[in-house]
């Protein structure tokens, strides 16, 4: 089976890397622009340079292209708490991040947010925090794995899932009120 | 078929409080981060809150950071808004959404779904 080309795909198919078809004239192969530039004028003819310019401030390509503008630059969101590891150039993006012990969580695929790495309080590190993922912490005896922090197991009521890992707890205070009564 | 009811809004004194809520149907709602937008008169929209699956990780926007508390209650594919210290400003139409997405270079996050929204309105 022919994998199913887009038209652009078709047109670029036709000549060699590196080169794309004329959109006025097919039996033209003009070569592409550099990355950190864009297309401001098909070749005129075989042999004759494509006419690139580099993009302006703001703007990048990050590889060879047949664009007709640039892209715009991505901008870090600071109420996401982004900041930014690396500035925009002509030939690449802004890379954006996250701060020392933070860790990105997704919103969705290229939108993430900045939280703090858990700490571990009342317990220990499982898996140490990662740049797309939290630490993964293992509570002491008497504590229990809420939102991936380790709280009392005082504050466990019997509706919740913390049952079973207070349930030595529990049944510990109900024997120490049940010893009072002879 | 997907369905986000939204309901609690009405009319409110400055520094009251509101809690909407909004009842999703026709998808797996536990599997699904839920968002609050709203839409102020002659405004556009702005993504207010978001919550995802578990209710470990919350979003904010800065104007009602500190006043607003998002949360769901998977057992009842149930999403929240809880409302405190309302000003003038926080007057809008309150959609609950789902399916964000968002690329660099065009700014605004878009959504998949919406509810047909609640009229939140803050006068004395």
């Known amino acids: 089976l022919v994998p199913h080309l887009g038209d652009r795909e078709k047109r670029d198919s036709v000549c060699p890397q590196g080169k794309y078809i004329h959109p006025q004239n097919n039996s033209i192969c003009c070569t592409k622009c550099h990355k950190g530039t864009y297309l401001y004028n098909d070749c005129p003819g075989p042999g004759q340079d494509t006419d690139c310019r580099e993009c302006e401030s703001g703007s990048f390509t990050a590889s060879e292209n047949h664009l007709r503008h640039c892209l715009s630059c991505s901008k870090c969101r600071k109420e996401m708490g982004q900041v930014e590891i690396s500035s925009c150039t002509v030939d690449r993006d802004t890379v954006c991040g996250c701060r020392k012990n933070q860790y990105r969580h997704y919103w969705s695929e290229n939108l993430f947010q900045c939280f703090n790495c858990s700490l571990c309080l009342n317990g220990t590190v499982h898996l140490s925090c990662q740049e797309k993922q939290n630490t993964v912490c293992t509570c002491h005896a008497g504590f229990f794995l809420r939102e991936n922090e380790c709280v009392s197991c005082s504050n466990c009521k019997k509706s919740l899932e913390c049952t079973k890992l207070c349930l030595p707890q529990i049944e510990n205070v109900k024997g120490t009120e049940d010893s009072g009564t002879t | 078929e997907v369905q986000l009811l939204e309901s609690g809004g009405g009319l409110v004194q400055p520094g009251g409080s509101l809690r909407l809520s909004c009842a999703a149907s026709?998808?797996?709602?536990?599997?699904?981060?839920m968002y609050w937008v709203r839409q102020a008169p002659g405004k556009g929209l702005e993504w207010v809150s978001g919550?995802?699956?578990?209710?470990?990780?919350?979003y904010y926007a800065d104007s009602v950071k500190g006043r607003f508390t998002i949360s769901r209650d998977n057992s009842k594919n149930t999403l929240y808004l809880q409302m405190n210290s309302l000003r003038a400003e926080d007057t809008a139409v309150y959609y609950c959404?789902?399916?964000?997405?968002?690329?660099?270079?065009?700014?605004?996050?878009?959504?998949?779904?919406w509810g047909q929204g609640t009229l939140v309105t803050v006068s004395s």
């Open positions: 026709g998808f797996t709602f536990p599997t699904e981060h």
């Open positions: 959404a789902k399916g964000l997405h968002w690329s660099s270079d065009s700014g605004p996050v878009h959504f998949d779904y």
């Open positions: 919550i995802d699956t578990g209710g470990s990780h919350t």
